[in-house]
Amino acid sequence: KFSKQSWGLENEALIVRCPRQGKPSYTVDWYYSQTNKSIPTQERNRVFASGQLLKFLPAAVADSGIYTCIVRSPTFNRTGYANVTIYKKQSDCNVPDYLMYSTVSGSEKNSKIYCPTIDLYNWTAPLEWFKNCQALQGSRYRAHKSFLVIDNVMTEDAGDYTCKFIHNENGANYSVTATRSFTVKDEQGFSLFPVIGAPAQNEIKEVEIGKNANLTCSACFGKGTQFLAAVLWQLNGTKITDFGEPRIQQEEGQNQSFSNGLACLDMVLRIADVKEEDLLLQYDCLALNLHGLRRHTVRLSRKNPIDHHS
């Protein structure tokens, strides 16, 4: 569960995040598992550790292997494993399956291809995009932030899309490429403004201090497959991943269910060992798609112990 596959190409930058997360203030130690040798933190090294990140600048085939990260806090240690594989660059245009990130789908109405892993890097716009090794040109293609938007998608737009960007580290530039497949689906359904089914707006959720609590954010977005829909939790206006409290996690993956033909998504927020300070936070369930954003706020309150009357 706490092991993650990462891959890259030789002579490109590769940055890997520790699969175990903690507060920014926690120490993270990295080791090369085969030799149990500590990864240095000095940036002059080609491979060095920087908190939760392990950086290969640039990567070499010999760097392949399993790396261990240990998140250390005053009260616990958490261990994760990064399985890193560095491949030689291909001479031809074909991108082998093992270098592919997850496939994304699009339709005539909405198509968005995110550049995989880009949020780990220090990059500046614009991104360069290629399809089957050809640079994309024409007004139908729009590079926006970390994704590509294709207007008026056609079946011929299916294929392998590669994003290319430059990672900057202390004034030195390193190239990074990432490829994923894009498939085009016939859009039979329709998309609406998100409708949040749970939680209710301004809901007060009773919790017990020291126990675990779950909050579910559930929203529907229309009929049929929805490509640009998401539900997520925020704590005091901050994404869970950026909040840095390991006790509070979003359940990975979003379940797309079809009740009454509606496309709905769920995201569960798990709070372990509820603490007093958790009651002071604002929990926002956000549901968003192409049409807009909907938000329901939840606050936690302490469950009063049941009075026992004689």
Partner: antibody, heavy 117, light 106 residues
Framework: QVQLVQSGAEVKKPGSSVKVSCKAS????????ISWVRQAPGQGLEWMGG????????NYAQSFQGRVTITADESTSTAYMELSSLRSEDTAVYYC??????????WGQGTTVTVSS | EIVMTQSPATLSVSPGERATLSCRAS??????LAWYQQKPGQAPRLLIY???TRATGIPARFSGSGSGTEFTLTISSLQSEDFAVYYC????????FGQGTKLEIK
Amino acid sequence: QVQLVQSGAEVKKPGSSVKVSCKASGYFFTSYGISWVRQAPGQGLEWMGGVIPISGTANYAQSFQGRVTITADESTSTAYMELSSLRSEDTAVYYCARDENGAFDIWGQGTTVTVSS
Amino acid sequence: EIVMTQSPATLSVSPGERATLSCRASQSVSSYLAWYQQKPGQAPRLLIYGASTRATGIPARFSGSGSGTEFTLTISSLQSEDFAVYYCQQYDNRPTFGQGTKLEIK
């Protein structure tokens, strides 16, 4: 307190572009959308489009499609509206507004854009 | 797009009396309807959302009702500061506003 502060008045020539900014403060910027609404002299309110800062996704009214670009910068809690190919009919007060589940609960003070040759 | 039609265009009422403003949608917008008040030289102010819920700080004399395609804003006892232009707005789909009702002193 919660507020939206817009950039100052602009005078533009026909055919040019204008970019208006809207700085948010006093609330969690990424938890809400920002919409832009304009009002021509003596006329009603017209929704131009909106942006979701957390995703960067923008949505535009059909009548402005291709001519307006709405963006948001999370790092500065600022939204922007750029309108191109200006014509005299674009002379109006342009408002940004916080989108609270579809209703606009907080408004900027408005930016007057005058298009004149 | 959903067309919002407000009536009347102008409404003349005496202070202390009740004012009733109407808004009709070209198709059902459920309860996704808001009302705004705008005074000259000022930005609009949200009065009602969800067809009937008063926004923060809005006096109890303002009330909203309706669902589907027919909506009403009622001001129970008009104060001098209530004379302004009122707009309805639907947000079931891409937002659209009504053309406004001007509430003037009789």
